[in-house]
Interface confidence: medium
């Protein structure tokens, strides 16, 4: 006869491990007992359990409540046992020793491998600001056994670096993602992808990038100066900028206070019917926590009466 077992039994932490040991004997042969022992190198054999044809299953005190026979129906030649709720410390070599009659004893070894799935964590780097050089965007750490694989999934251009720390029964892998911050990266996802044989599917943790910036400010509304004449209604100036965080707007007049009747509505300055009083230099001040910008324009309210009396001299230079 001969013993049938597996070279390696792989189980995920917390699952039950079936340690197979089946005696394929000739007709008339009987199995008297099957002894299971842990036989790690450098240490003596430690009995795990003994299945006896007459006395039943005996379990070592160290494994009390954790070793069982597989559920019925059972073959009397099957010496397999179940190791409940596998822990990392169970990883190692096991020996099955079968005593048969009349053929004698047979033994076989297997290795139990306990996979410890990682629980990844993602840590964002320092605040990202446009104008910085290469900066840490995020780091992702996962510890498991065997060592997990940590990669990044993103449309953002950047560089990665990984390092690994080995512990007695596991390994921790940390991967860092560095980039040169730009406003185009705002709102872009940066996803840490962790792969491991103990996971049914990759674990993904997504971080949304926030890059602080403030665009140059500009003022719209003066494109056609001829529209800015006495009596015109609905004239307005609009301050254009964008930023992260969203900026706030403030309007002032450089050559004095804002004229009465002028309404400030965020980025927009609204004028009552225009008078010459409204001529002047207006400043839009844009700011967020990252920076501030100014843009100024000169408003010159035209008096149509004056313009019609003026003559235009054309001077040609040759």
């Amino acid at each position: 006869g001969e013993l049938e077992t597996s070279d390696v039994v792989t189980v995920v932490l917390g699952q039950d491990a079936k340690l197979p040991c089946f005696y394929r004997g000739d007709s008339g042969e009987q199995v008297g007992q099957v002894a299971w022992a842990r036989v790690d190198a450098g240490e003596g054999a430690q009995e795990l359990a003994l299945l006896h044809s007459k006395y039943g299953l005996h379990v070592s005190p160290a494994y009390e409540g954790r070793v069982e026979q597989p559920p019925p129906p059972r073959n009397p030649l099957d010496g397999s046992v179940l190791l409940r709720n596998a822990v990392q410390a169970d990883e190692g070599e096991y020996e099955c020793r079968v005593s048969t009659f009349p053929a004698g004893s047979f033994q076989a070894r297997l290795r139990l491998r306990v996979l410890v799935p990682p629980l990844p964590s993602l840590n964002p780097g320092p605040a990202l600001e446009e104008g910085q050089g290469l900066t840490l965007a995020a780091s992702c750490t996962a510890e498991g056994s065997p060592a997990p694989s940590v990669t990044w999934d993103t449309e953002v251009k950047g560089t990665t670096s990984s390092r690994s720390f080995k512990h007695s029964r596991s390994a921790a892998v940390t991967s860092e993602f560095h980039l040169v911050p730009s406003r185009s990266m705002n709102g872009q996802p940066l996803t840490c992808v962790v792969s491991h044989p103990g996971l049914l599917q990759d674990q993904r943790i997504t971080h949304i990038l926030h890059v602080s910036f403030l665009a140059e400010a500009s003022v719209r509304g003066l494109e056609d100066q001829n529209l800015w004449h006495i009596g015109r209604e609905g004239a307005m100036l609009k301050c254009l900028s964008e930023g992260q965080p969203p900026p706030s707007y403030n309007w002032t007049r450089l050559d004095g206070p804002l004229p009465s009747g002028v309404r400030v509505d965020g980025d927009t300055l609204g004028f009552p019917p225009l008078t010459t009083e409204h001529s002047g230099i207006y400043v839009c001040h844009v700011s967020n926590e990252f920076s501030s910008r100014d843009s100024q324009v000169t408003v010159d309210v035209l008096d149509p009466q004056e313009d019609s009396g003026k003559q235009v001299d054309l001077v040609s230079a040759s």
Epitope: Q33, A35, A49, H58, V59, P61
Partner: nanobody, 118 residues
Framework: EVQLVESGGGLVQPGGSLRLSCAAS????????MGWYRQAPGKQREYVAT???????NYADSVRGRFTISRDNAENTVYLQMDSLRAEDTAVYYC????????????WGRGTQVTVSS
Amino acid sequence: EVQLVESGGGLVQPGGSLRLSCAASRSTFSLNIMGWYRQAPGKQREYVATITSGGSTNYADSVRGRFTISRDNAENTVYLQMDSLRAEDTAVYYCTAELVRRGPTTYWGRGTQVTVSS
């Protein structure tokens, strides 16, 4: 040949405790399984508990949680600690040992009387 000699039996009140010993005439480490059976008057011999040379144990459901089997391979002795004894535990307790070679050879002691009565 292996001689097994039991001791420790006696009369005890319900709820009391006794400790039985069984000394073997040869190294118990070569004795693969040692254990205890019992036989009450007019009944068949009944399995109580067994222990392997490596210390793995098994118990009959009727005694699990009340009796504890242990062995000292250096002293060639197996013990049965009996707690929370009941009247139905009254019986002659026999020590058994099995040697595995080409086939199982089982040895028996002569028994020790345990009586649980008030």
